[in-house]
């Protein structure tokens, strides 16, 4: 092809060439043609002869103001076409009259601003239609009954005032899964235009200036459709009351978006008449007081989202919004309540009473005064099935015994990015039976006793990360009742001491966080007492993490029980020798990270069975002695291995001797090394 | 399931040593801290200490920290306790036991070895 | 360390009559404390940990409870085999303090 197109698989890309013509030299039995964002005028039917096989055709972001009606002549297969982000203006009866086997067609952003006629009348296949960002001032796409098979009506983005009967009944056969009408001026709605669609599922009128007024008429002219889904975001809907939605009564809707509405004022059993809702979002509001009614009704409703829904009006403690005792429990089905991001002054002894299906709360930054948890905190929550508490980003300081002692179904905890500063004595956790869970990283420091777990033997995954970490050093060992942990994250904590009994029993562990800590004294021989073999019993270990330790030496043995090792990190530490053999036991090593040492000889000896299996290696940045004995069987290794070693031309550099000083180590020349022979497999 | 075995009485005289034994079994020794418990007739429990028979490192009561040394060796699955310069006070059941799952607890006790301090 | 007291030292009571043993701890134990059971010439048994958690095969008529560094043990129904010696102990760090014990006989 003298184009510049690629094609695989039957499937040509020719964007983004600047073509001002269709190529002619493709091969013949592409079924997928690209020609998006290039500068083609037209699209002349003789050239698609040779493309008969296509099925999609892509022409966005061009400067086509016209289409030959033959086009789709040459194209009997085609059923998905696009024309997005072009010039057409007029659409007459003759332009898509060979295209029969459409499913999509997209035409959105052009400059289409009347349909006259029937253009589509012969789309019986068409399943979505967009024609959004264009300039139409109504919703009359035809004169006659048509488009029966379509299910998604894209309008959004254009000047369409009134949703009128006698445009909307060209789709007296179709059901409509979406109609999509946002970002229009809708004032009206006359009576009976969405009864003259066969069925409508979805609606969507999202940025549509409504308000209460218009809300409560649009759901009068619903009553009695098949609308399931419907959506009114951004439509400046500042309240609710018993009537607004009055008109759904009639209906099954199951889906209700009122998401950056600034709603203000949710008045009381606003939504009894929605018992079949089952998916509610109502995130990014403005409501200053939740009633005990105001959710009334809602006996469905599985997915609540409340983020952002109440926010302070000023600085002043008597504008923080409040959510009245019992407001929740109508919501009998509710599986899953996000309520981030809110300014709620704190939990009240009934606030989350009634919820008995609750699975997943999130809590993150939802409250301005949330200090401590005490066993009374969540004693609402106690007849809810909770499995996942996210209590993020509280400014939480302090944990109470029984704190979490009506969660007993609670799997997952997470407390990170508060402020907790306390000792843990493990009554912290009393009740959490079932609990795989507890992410305490990012808080303010926790000094742990040998009890600080002991209640919760179940917990498979700890993560505390940052936490100034005190007694870790405590023997027994603060870990020793966790023997479920597969994971443990310890890192960043400027640790120091650890006995060698630390993670005894923990043989189920995968995946052991150390990075940024100060462990290094423990590997030296000179240690009193010798190397701190801390990492003994790990028999299931996949990943090990030691970066930013410090660590000058390794002890041969260190890895040795590590026999399901899959990636090690040692990056930036001042590693410069590796005894012989520290990764002879290191059979299932994928990922080998040593980047940022002091590292001048890569042997054979040492590295040789690190390497047998390595998917990963990183070993940029290290002084490399760029002599035989040091490195010539590395660099015959790398030239020959498949094993990705990113940046390899550019950070993996020869620091000595003096004349190869920045030299790529990859170039170094070996054919005058005696005994440089890669290792054989 | 796990047992604790222990030899059911001693007889020693004053100012000498004795060493009792505490044989476990049913699970894997050296994932389970021993600890060591002292009962005079007709009288209370007393904890002694209690040792990682992992790694032999030991936490004793300071009560007991000259009169007991405790020891394992790992090859037999058997913990021991010295006790030395045996006077009537030493006179009493030894019993060896072990936390269970949940670590704030004895569910599993040696049935106990009765030493007499007599001459 | 922490101290132990428990009281009272002896009980006289009655098959079918209901019975309370306290210990109290001189420092806060934080809910780590076990409840035994023992017979003439044998082993303790564990009865109740963690204050208040029943150990596996304890009949339902024991029960634990704790306010403050105060923590019972109640017995309802006495039953023939119920008599013997009754010992608490702390769990909060060492050494693991137990009680003098409770004698409680049959009437």
């Known amino acids: 092809s003298t184009t510049k197109c690629t094609v695989s698989h039957e499937v040509a890309d020719c964007s983004h060439l600047k073509l001002t013509q269709v190529p002619d030299d493709l091969p013949t039995n592409i079924t997928v043609l690209n020609l998006t964002h290039n500068q083609l005028r037209r699209l002349p039917a003789a050239n698609f002869t040779r493309y008969s096989q296509l099925t999609s055709l892509d022409v966005g972001f061009n400067t086509i103001s016209k289409l030959e009606p033959e086009l789709c002549q040459k194209l009997p297969m085609l059923k998905v076409l696009n024309l997005q982000h072009n010039e057409l203006s007029q659409l007459s009866d003759k332009t898509f009259a060979f295209c029969t086997n459409l499913t999509e067609l997209h035409l959105m952003s052009n400059s289409i601003q009347k349909i006259k006629n029937n253009p589509f009348v012969k789309q019986k296949n068409l399943i979505t239609l967009d024609l959004s960002h264009n300039g139409l001032s109504s919703t009359k796409l035809g004169t006659q009954v048509q488009l029966e098979n379509l299910q998604e009506l894209l309008l959004s983005n254009n000047k369409i005032q009134a949703l009128k009967s006698e445009e909307l009944d060209i789709f007296a056969n179709s059901s409509l899964k979406k109609l999509e009408l946002s970002s229009n001026q809708i004032k009206e709605f006359s009576p009976g235009c969405f009864h003259a669609i066969g069925r409508l599922f979805g609606l969507f009128l999202n940025n549509v200036q409504l308000g209460p007024s218009l809300t409560e008429k649009l759901c009068l002219e619903l009553a009695n459709t098949s609308i399931r889904n419907l959506s009114l975001s951004n439509s400046q809907l500042s309240t609710t009351s018993n009537t607004t939605f009055l008109g759904l009564k009639w209906t099954n809707l199951t889906m209700l978006d009122l998401s950056y509405n600034n709603l203000n004022v949710v008045g009381n059993d606003s939504f009894a008449w929605l018992p079949q809702l089952e998916y509610f979002f109502l995130e990014y509001n403005n409501i200053q007081h939740l009633f005990s009614h105001s959710l009334h009704g809602l006996f469905n409703v599985r997915y609540l989202n409340l983020k952002r829904s109440f926010t302070k009006q000023s600085i002043s403690l008597a504008s923080l919004p409040k959510i009245d005792d019992f407001s929740f429990q109508w919501l009998k089905c509710l599986e899953h309540l996000n309520m981030e991001d809110n300014d709620i002054p704190g939990i009240k002894s009934n606030m989350f009473t009634g919820l008995i299906n609750l699975k997943y709360l999130s809590l993150s930054n939802s409250f301005t005064s949330l200090r401590t948890l005490t066993n009374e905190t969540f004693v609402s929550l106690a007849h809810s099935p909770l499995h996942i508490l996210n209590l993020t980003k509280n400014k939480i300081s302090k944990i109470e015994s029984d704190a979490f002692s009506w969660l007993g179904h609670l799997e997952v905890l997470d407390l990170g990015l508060n402020e907790i500063g306390q000792e843990l004595t493990g009554q912290e956790w009393r009740g959490l039976e079932n609990i795989f869970e507890i992410y305490l990283s990012y808080n303010k420091y926790l000094q742990l006793t040998r009890n600080s777990f002991a209640l919760v033997p179940s917990l498979q995954r700890l993560m505390l990360r940052r936490v100034a970490l005190k007694n870790v050093d405590s023997s027994p060992s603060p870990f020793q009742p966790l023997r479920n942990l597969t994971i443990l994250d310890l890192s960043n904590n400027n640790i120091a001491n650890i006995n060698d009994d630390m993670l005894e029993g923990l043989e189920k562990l995968e995946i052991l966080d150390l990075q940024h800590n100060n462990l290094a004294r423990l590997w030296k021989h000179a240690n009193p007492g010798g190397p701190i073999y801390f990492l003994k019993g790990l028999s299931h270990l996949h990943i090990l993490n030691l970066e930013s330790n410090g660590f000058d030496e390794i002890p041969v043995e260190v890895f040795k029980d590590l026999f399901e090792l899959k990636i090690i990190d040692l990056g930036l530490n001042n590693l410069n020798t590796l005894p012989a053999s520290v990764f002879n036991n290191q059979v299932s090593l994928k990922s080998l990270n040593l980047q940022k040492n002091l590292i001048t000889s890569v042997e054979k000896k040492v590295f040789g069975p690190a390497f047998r299996n390595l998917t990963e290696l990183d070993m940029r940045f290290n002084p490399f002695d760029c002599t035989c004995e040091s490195i010539a069987w590395f660099v015959n290794w790398i030239n020959e291995t498949h094993t990705n070693i990113p940046e390899l031309s550019s950070h993996y550099l020869c620091n000595t001797p003096p004349h190869y000083h920045g030299f790529p180590v990859r170039l170094f020349d070996t054919s005058s090394c005696k005994d440089s022979a890669p290792f054989e497999l | 399931q796990v047992q604790l075995q222990q030899p059911g009485a001693e007889l020693v005289q004053p100012g000498t040593s004795v060493r009792l034994s505490c044989k476990a079994s049913g699970y894997i020794f050296t994932t389970y801290w021993i600890h060591w418990v002292k009962q005079r007739p007709g009288q209370g429990l007393e904890w002694i200490g209690e040792?990682?028979?992992?790694?032999?490192?030991?936490n004793y009561n300071e009560k007991f920290k000259t009169k007991a040394t405790l020891t394992v060796d790992k090859s037999s699955s058997t913990a021991y306790m010295q006790l030395s310069s045996l006077t009537s006070e030493d006179s009493a059941v030894y019993y060896c036991?072990?936390?269970?799952?949940?670590?704030?607890?004895?569910?599993?006790w040696g049935q106990g070895t009765l030493v007499t301090v007599s001459a | 360390d922490i101290q132990m007291t428990q009281s009272p030292a002896s009980l006289s009571a009655s098959v079918g009559e209901t019975v309370t043993i306290t210990c109290r701890a001189s420092g806060n134990i934080h809910n780590y404390l076990a409840w035994y059971q023992q017979k003439q010439g044998k082993s303790p048994q564990l009865l109740v940990y963690?204050?208040?958690t029943l150990a596996d095969g304890v009949p339902s008529r024991f029960s634990g409870s704790e306010s403050g560094t105060q923590y019972s043990l109640k017995i309802n129904s006495l039953q023939p085999e119920d008599f013997g010696s009754y010992y608490c102990q702390h769990f909060w760090s060492t050494p693991f303090t137990f009680g003098s014990g409770t004698k409680l006989e049959l009437k």
């Open positions: 040792i990682n028979p992992n790694n032999g490192r030991i």
């Open positions: 036991t072990r936390v269970g799952v949940m670590i704030t607890t004895f569910p599993y």
């Open positions: 963690n204050a208040k």
